[in-house]
């Protein structure tokens, strides 16, 4: 922490300007008034303060705004944003997409995924929902950031906005997030023809239930293996060999490459070996011929 000293009269700061780069940390602490700093935040990012000097300026703002910075300050944080922790950002109320854009630009190239995720969360809360303008801003300035939102926040996405989401925006989404987004995508694309529908829905299929995957297998979609590997394990396990063959079409040969990886490995273990043999891929690990499978979970549910 910076030691408290009194400011010599000749060092008193009446405006935030470039000469402050020469102020030692203790001089900044003593001579820069927090209210002046907040009022002239728009000047701060034009001044190449060292990161240690920025620590001092942050400390001053923290003291002035213990409950969180106002958006007028947040908008102009610039490189000072790099000093913020997720805990700091959680105190903010952000509604302006211009503020979001400015801070996303600053964070580029820095390891700030937790801070950015928290910032986006605050924007969604501040705006009330994840509207089209917000999604457009995220896809333009922070590809992949959509997936930093919690499933609860993603549930506020109206289906009408889903069309603005690009495949690469979903690359880092986990199963719980896709569980939320998939039904919205299904609704958004429901009036499209078979092939067009599949192209649109494909990035969201990690959230699809078994019945929808089964339905796709009847539509000659020739699902690529990368998409198949992202399907929920629970959605893949009930599929028959014939259904998987129809679903993948010419891509079925890729199962051999993924034989040891989930969900393919788990699916193989549930299939009869003689059914697997019909694929002619040499897949091993299915249920040997002549064995009877008892699903005890069903019996327990009945008793």
């Amino acid at each position: 922490d910076v030691e408290r000293t009194t400011c010599p009269p000749e060092k008193e700061v009446h405006e935030i300007d470039e000469s402050l780069i020469f102020y030692k940390k203790r001089e900044l602490e003593a001579c820069v008034d927090a209210a002046l700093l907040a009022a002239q935040m728009d000047r701060v990012d034009a001044i190449p303060f060292t990161y240690e000097q920025l620590d001092v300026l942050k400390h001053k703002l923290d003291e002035l705004y213990p409950q969180g910075y106002p958006e007028s300050v947040i908008r102009h944080l610039g490189h000072l944003f790099l000093k913020m922790s997720p805990e700091d950002i959680r105190k903010w109320n952000v509604t302006s997409l211009e503020t979001l854009k400015a801070l996303l630009k600053v964070s580029k190239g820095h390891e700030m995924s937790a801070q950015v995720a928290t910032l986006i969360d605050r924007v969604v809360v501040g705006r009330g929902q994840l509207d089209k303008d917000t999604v457009d801003t995220l896809t333009a300035f922070c590809p992949g950031c959509l997936c930093s939102l919690s499933p609860e926040r993603l549930s506020s996405v109206p289906p009408s906005v889903i069309g603005a989401v690009r495949p690469q925006d979903l690359d880092t989404c986990g199963p719980r997030q896709l569980d939320v987004l998939y039904p919205k995508a299904r609704l958004a694309f429901q009036n499209m023809s078979g092939s067009e529908y599949f192209v649109k829905i494909r990035p969201f299929l990690g959230g699809a239930p078994t019945e929808d995957v089964k339905a796709l297998s009847q539509q000659n979609v020739s699902m690529d293996l990368a998409t198949f590997m992202k399907l929920r394990r629970e959605a893949v396990l009930p599929l028959t060999v014939a259904e998987v063959q129809k679903l993948l079409g010419p891509h079925v040969e890729g199962l051999k490459v993924e034989e040891q990886h989930s969900p393919v490995r788990d699916w193989i273990l549930k299939q009869r070996q003689d059914d697997l043999d019909t694929l002619g891929l040499g897949l091993q690990g299915g249920i040997p011929n002549g064995y009877l499978i008892l699903d005890l979970s069903v019996r327990e549910a009945l008793s």
Epitope: E18, S19, I21, F22, P48, T50, E52, Q53, L54
Partner: nanobody
Amino acid sequence: EVQVVESGGGLVQAGASLRLSCASSGRTISPIAMAWFRQAPGKERELVAGLTWTGRTYYSDSVKGRFTISRDNAKNTVYLQMDSLKFEDTAVYFCAAGDNPDRRGSSWSSSSVYEYWGQGTQVTVSS
């Protein structure tokens, strides 16, 4: 690559004046900061005066009111006018230029911030 060359040092009586010059070459854009540091025997290098790319100045407490830093853009030269010299001003004076793109260091008063340095010029003030 920026080259920095100081001149103007010498031996003077206490109370006299000297003007140090720092000629820089090697690029057309002004560095973010030009500064004069000094180092007395057995002591750390300390900032004497600094000048930003916009012309703002800064002086250490020990020289404020006696020293003036200025620049002649046409000649790519920074000056340090030293008046009312004291015995304590005796040191090797260094000119430094820096951009500090990584924003390292505690402040621009720290010598670690500057990428380009001259060889230094000796100033000796006799009492």
